[in-house]
Interface confidence: low
């Protein structure tokens, strides 16, 4: 189960929740977002305050890591296995460091299986950052600093940190080093949402949430 | 003395393909973003891609991404400006530029003296 | 992309005038901006870097101000060498330069 499936069963409060995986008794913790636009959504990725490394291999990206309640990575098998049971939106909020908000919606979003290097499927932008995809399209296999899936002679993970679904590099990476305001311009292997702020403007924070089409 | 010579300027056909060369000296080249950027005859100056100090990161001007690639050889001090289908529009002085960043990519500080490209039938 | 776009793109001008010449940025470039000095026939000449540090070895009637998307150069008392076209470069999202302001004698 999923937030979604938390809030119709009556939880509408914000908080952590124990999910669990699709046609398994496997429990994953997770934070709900029961408020943002009605509700219902599972937060998969959360950057804050920098407070959690996001340097991790591919092991740790695959089963998460971080604080639910603070910055984290909820881990790419789970929502693998949730995004190929039925249909999902992908919504990222970004915040940068002059007190401004935009975000991505994609009306439809999965991820391929672990033997698929967790290669990422989007349809559908909406959203006020930006016109064109951040992330790039078609959408490309996740990257590692120990799995390097991406289009680069070089090794994208390495070089820009952070997991993400590299291309050669690309214009996104949210699991990039985290920098203080006033350090945060023209740092490329910050957090970094092209077609909003730029390739060298490292965003304050970031959250990507998914949540059933239907629901 | 920091000094960029570029080389390799010549006059090519449309379609054709050319590779510049840019030899530096007078300063640690392993240590800085190195970039090419160009000047139409009696226009003005055009970024056209640059390169990361280990040369694992690359950025291009949008009309001549899969057409330009850069690279460098720090061992000898060289940058490269490979030049494929080439048009009429890239008609230009390919200056060798320093970008003054270590950490971050900012302004050029240092200037080669140029190298035409001339690109005609 | 970020568009700089310089005004006036000729200034005629005499010896011991102030000039002042003007780069704007579609969007925010925070102070991520240069100033360049090109003569004919010769590469550009970087003068001032984030909108307002003056390079090594520039003269001080050269100075740079503004932030965000309003930037000025001034040259407080033109010189006989100052006649020259002048660029402005963002270097905040790529690396992109104004079209020039060329800066002649009146």
């Known amino acids: 189960r999923d937030c979604a499936e938390v809030f119709k069963s009556g939880h509408t409060t914000n908080g952590i929740y124990t999910l669990t995986f699709p046609n398994s008794t496997e429990e994953i913790k997770a934070y709900c977002d029961m408020e943002a636009g009605g509700g219902g959504w599972t937060i998969i990725q959360r950057r804050e305050d920098g407070s959690v490394d996001f340097q991790r291999t591919w092991k740790e990206y695959k089963v998460g890591f971080g604080n639910p309640s603070g910055e984290y990575w909820l881990g790419n098998e789970f929502v693998s296995q949730l995004t190929n049971q039925q249909r999902y939106v992908l919504k990222i909020h970004l915040k940068d460091w002059e007190g401004n908000e935009a975000y991505s919606l994609y009306e439809h979003f999965y991820l391929s299986s672990e033997e698929l290097n967790y290669r990422i499927h989007l349809k559908g932008l909406t959203g006020t950052a930006g016109k064109i995809s951040s992330i790039s399209q078609p959408g490309n296999d996740f990257s590692t600093k120990d799995g390097d899936n991406d289009k680069c002679i070089c090794k994208c993970s390495q070089m820009l940190t952070g997991g993400w679904w590299f291309d050669a590099c690309g214009p996104s990476n949210l699991n990039g080093m985290y920098y203080p305001q006033r350090q945060n311009t023209n740092k490329f292997n910050g957090i970094k949402w092209y077609y909003w702020k730029g390739s060298g403007y490292s965003l304050k924070a970031t959250t990507m949430m998914i949540r059933p089409a239907d629901f | 003395e920091v000094q960029l010579v570029e080389s390799g300027g010549d006059l090519v056909q449309p379609g054709g393909s050319l590779r510049l060369s840019c030899t530096a000296s007078?300063?640690?080249?392993?240590?800085?973003?190195m970039t090419w950027v160009r000047q139409a005859p009696g226009r003005g100056l055009e970024w056209v891609a640059n390169i990361k100090e280990d040369g694992n990161e690359k950025y291009f001007l949008d009309s001549v991404k899969g057409r330009f690639t850069i690279s460098r050889d720090n061992a000898k001090d060289l940058l490269f400006l490979q030049m494929n289908s080439l048009r009429g529009e890239d008609t230009a002085v390919y200056y060798c530029?320093?970008?003054?960043?270590?950490?971050?990519?900012?302004?050029?500080?240092?200037w080669g003296q140029g190298t035409l490209v001339t690109v005609s039938s | 992309d970020i568009q700089m776009t310089q005004s006036p793109s000729t200034l005629s001008a005499s010896v011991g005038d102030r000039v002042t010449v003007t780069c704007r940025a579609s969007?925010?470039?925070?102070?991520?901006l240069a100033w360049y000095q090109q003569k004919p026939g010769k590469a550009p000449k970087l003068l001032i870097s984030?909108?307002?540090s003056l390079e090594s070895g520039v003269p001080s009637r050269f100075s740079g101000s503004g932030s965000g998307t309003e930037f000025t150069l001034t040259i407080s008392s033109l010189q006989p060498d100052d006649f020259a076209t002048y660029y402005c470069?963002?270097?905040?999202?790529?690396?992109?330069f104004g079209q020039g302001t060329m800066v002649e004698i009146k």
């Open positions: 007078g300063f640690t080249f392993s240590k800085y973003w």
């Open positions: 984030k909108a307002s």
């Open positions: 530029v320093r970008d003054r960043g270590i950490e971050v990519a900012g302004p050029f500080d240092y």
């Open positions: 969007q925010t470039i925070i102070n991520w």
């Open positions: 470069q963002q270097y905040n999202r790529y690396w992109t």
